[in-house]
Interface confidence: medium
């Protein structure tokens, strides 16, 4: 028997520095977690103690904090190289700055293989990107070899900016021939490493013949055997065992997100490459694990540029950006409109001639808007200003919801109207009319939504049984501010870009902004 230790991360999302327990900015260092310096300490400790160790990343290193905004992926390559990752799969967010934003900072600089078997380049890009990412890689580990085959969510064109010269194929269809090829090369231990979410990870384990282990990402799935060490609630045991169609027991793992945990899986193979046993658990990277001093020093050196960036002008406003709670928790506010417009703009993807865009709607809890911006400071808007408006370090995510769920969400928005509560929704691509004279739960009297399958966008009545795409804060997608119906009824949830980054990019693009209050939210006392 031969034993392999798989260490794995996924969805780190630019958390190079340690964070608080909820993965936001570290405030009290004695209670902080994660970060590459602490990760390196634990990885080195395991590498010294165990013979056959692989360190793998399942994608979405890109996007999430000011580190990515400023360094644009160079930080990912630098620190992953320093940690000596063995392989990485491409995630959807690796394409956020286009293909060039992946090639130059990461693909050309990484000293480890970057993988995806279901992304095929065509046209002029094919030769430019050739060899910079691979469908699979055979890695020597001790006296043996292990095949790693990569995959990426086929939804990436809707979630990021991969351009028109990359084709995202069905994961299972693309993986099988690559695994077969590895088998012909006499590689009998094969790990599928990828970024398509837990449901697809399980399908790959079930359907792709020859895959021994699946290491996934994208869905931020936390798996744990026993009593979990922090706030995350396990979606299942670690590893999650799937019985493949050909009768094998295939372990599937994921390690939550944001570098909070290091996935730790021990696999025992027999001489024919069959998995005999698998066990392990994610390791919580809390303050009991010291930060490696050399990596920490490097982080501090790179940090300097971030502090300078925070005070630079991104663009100008020629109007007061009303982000006050007196406005945003009671009525349409122009800060809410600005943020929602930025959220939609960030999700412009012309992937189908029938649609002007794949999503037109945004909702945003008024309580998430924490500060106004005064235009009388020469109109200047800085990252620092935006960090006061959006201080929670969240993301703006893409969900799919039924019309009936949206209706419930808007009822919840005003169910206790007048108490300055945070659930009052700001909107984009939506016209809502409330009648507050009616009982809670029956106050939404009109809800029109901007069409997507149209050449000239116009507002149509919400159809209760239709499925709509909506951009919203991850806080709402997770049921925050009492929006349990969103969490319970969402049909799909894809994690998006850092909130401040979305708004800052929009302001930089527009250069001068002047958002208005324009009748997106109205109040009526209608008779019937």
């Amino acid at each position: 028997a031969w034993e392999l230790t798989i260490l794995h991360t996924n969805d780190v999302h630019s958390r190079l520095e340690q964070t608080s327990e909820d993965s936001s900015k570290c405030v009290n260092a004695s209670r902080c977690m994660g970060g590459v310096a602490r990760l390196f300490t634990k990885v080195q400790q395991i590498r010294r103690a165990e013979p056959n160790v692989l360190l793998l990343d399942a994608g979405d290193q890109y996007q999430g904090t000011i580190w990515f905004t400023v360094y644009k992926g160079a930080e990912v390559a630098h620190f992953m190289n320093a940690l000596r990752y063995d392989a990485m799969a491409l995630g959807n967010h690796e394409f956020d700055n286009g293909v060039e934003g992946l090639i130059e900072p990461l693909l050309k600089e990484a000293k480890f293989p970057i993988l995806s078997a279901n992304i095929k380049a065509k046209g002029p890009l094919a030769s430019q990107i050739s060899g910079l990412y691979l469908p699979y890689k055979v890695l020597p580990v001790g006296d043996e070899v292990v095949g790693i085959v990569g995959y990426t969510s086929k939804e990436t064109p809707f979630l990021s900016n991969p351009g028109t010269n990359l084709v995202f194929e069905d994961e299972i269809t693309a993986l099988q021939p690559e695994v077969d090829k590895l088998k012909t090369l006499n590689v009998n231990k094969i790990i599928a490493l990828g970024h398509s979410g837990f449901e697809m990870d399980k399908l790959i384990a079930q359907k792709v013949r020859g895959v021994d282990v699946v290491v996934g990402g994208h869905s931020n799935t936390f798996l744990y055997t026993g009593n979990p060490p922090s706030k995350e609630v396990p979606a299942g045991k670690y590893p999650f065992i799937v019985t493949s169609d050909d009768g094998r027991k295939v372990p599937v793992v994921q390690a939550y997100a944001f570098g909070k945990y290091l996935g730790y899986l021990k696999i025992e193979f027999d001489e024919r490459g069959n998995v005999i046993s698998s066990h392990g658990n994610p390791i919580l990277l809390n303050s009991s694990i010291p930060e490696d001093p050399s990596i920490k020093a490097d982080i501090n050196k790179w940090r300097i540029k971030l502090d300078n960036y925070s005070t630079q002008e991104l663009g100008k406003t020629i109007v007061y950006l009303d982000g006050s709670s007196q406005s945003c928790r009671f009525r349409e506010c122009n800060m809410g409109n600005l943020i929602c417009d930025a959220m939609i703009n960030n999700n412009l993807r012309h992937t189908d001639e029938m649609f002007w865009n794949h999503v037109s709607m945004c909702i945003l809890n008024g309580g998430g808007i924490r500060s106004p911006i005064d235009e009388r400071n020469n109109g200047t808007i800085t990252w620092e200003n935006l960090a006061a408006v959006l201080p929670f370090g969240g993301t703006f995510d893409l969900v799919q919801l039924k019309g009936s769920t949206l209706k419930k969400a808007f009822e919840h928005s005003v169910h206790r109207y007048g108490q300055s509560t945070g659930e009052f929704l700001q909107v984009g691509g939506i016209h809502v009319v409330y009648d507050l004279s009616r009982k809670p739960g029956d106050r939404v009297v009109k809800l029109d939504v901007l069409c997507t399958k149209c050449r000239v966008p116009s507002y149509d009545p919400l159809k209760m049984d239709e499925v709509y795409k909506v951009i919203l804060p991850n806080f709402l997608a997770n049921g925050g501010d009492g929006f349990q119906m969103i969490k319970d009824e969402l049909l799909r949830h894809d994690s998006g870009d850092q909130d401040i980054n979305v708004v800052s990019t929009y302001i930089s693009k527009m250069k001068v902004i002047y958002p208005a209050v324009e009748g997106r939210i109205k109040f009526s006392t209608g008779s019937h």
Epitope: K446, D465, H528
Partner: antibody, heavy 125, light 110 residues
């Protein structure tokens, strides 16, 4: 496929009562307002009554107000029209129709996007 | 009597463009949105236009609606024989607190 099927029509004497039913399938019934619309032989369409998704808002056309009662049972996916004190001028084909919205308010007026095939009510002595 | 009026009949030849109009008052068409319904012989009505000018999916773009003041109109371009039907406009009426239909227009394709 969304379907509305009316039943309960027939021949009835003036002054008597009749109860029409409409069975809905293929939709989440309690998400929508519902209506009764009638069409006298050789004549145009006439809105009779409407009811909001949760029965909180109900409306009637003047000629039937006080005589007809609209109701719904969301658990049974059914809409009803109780017609009392029937008159000869109530003779018509009665259609059940689904609203595009959930309310009966002017602010949420869109239109009726699914119709049944109708049930005939004849009031005659 | 009908509070929203339509001309009783209209006609056109195949390929032609025909317009059916509907006239009301400030309490209905003037202050509210208009729908149009098509009723083919012996069948139930079908929603053709809502919110003045919006077509439900499946309705050909040959049909278009517009509204100006207290009048609304339905235009049918590239008239086809299968367009022969009764056409009804409808609106909310504030004074009646309910929905009203026009008297209907019978369209004949010559």
């Amino acid at each position: 496929e969304v379907q509305l099927v009316e039943s309960g029509g027939g021949l009835v004497q003036p002054g008597r009562s009749l109860r029409l039913s409409c069975a809905a399938s293929g939709l989440t019934f309690d998400d929508y307002a519902m209506h009764w619309v009638r069409q006298a032989p050789g004549k145009g369409l006439e809105w009779v009554s409407g009811i909001s998704w949760n029965s909180n808002s109900i409306g009637y056309a003047d000629p039937v107000r006080g005589r007809f009662t609209i109701s719904r049972d969301n658990a049974k996916n059914s809409l009803y029209l109780q017609m009392n004190s029937l008159r000869a001028e109530d003779t018509a084909l009665y259609y059940c129709a689904k609203d595009m919205g959930w309310e009966l308010l002017k602010t949420s007026y869109y239109g009726m996007d699914v119709w049944g095939q109708g049930t005939t009510v004849t009031v005659s002595s | 009597q009908t509070v929203v009026t339509q001309e009783p009949s209209a006609s056109g030849t195949p390929g032609q463009r025909v317009t059916i109009s509907c006239s009301g008052s400030s309490s209905n068409i003037g202050g509210n949105t208009v729908n149009w319904y098509q009723q083919l012989p012996g069948t139930a009505p079908k929603l053709l236009i809502y919110s003045n000018n919006q077509r439900p999916s499946g309705v050909p773009d040959r049909f278009s609606g517009s509204k100006s003041g207290i009048s609304a109109s339905l235009a049918i371009s590239g008239l086809q024989s299968e367009d022969e039907a009764d056409y009804y406009c409808a609106a909310w009426d504030d004074s009646l607190n309910g929905r009203v239909f026009g008297g209907g227009t019978k369209l004949t394709v010559l």
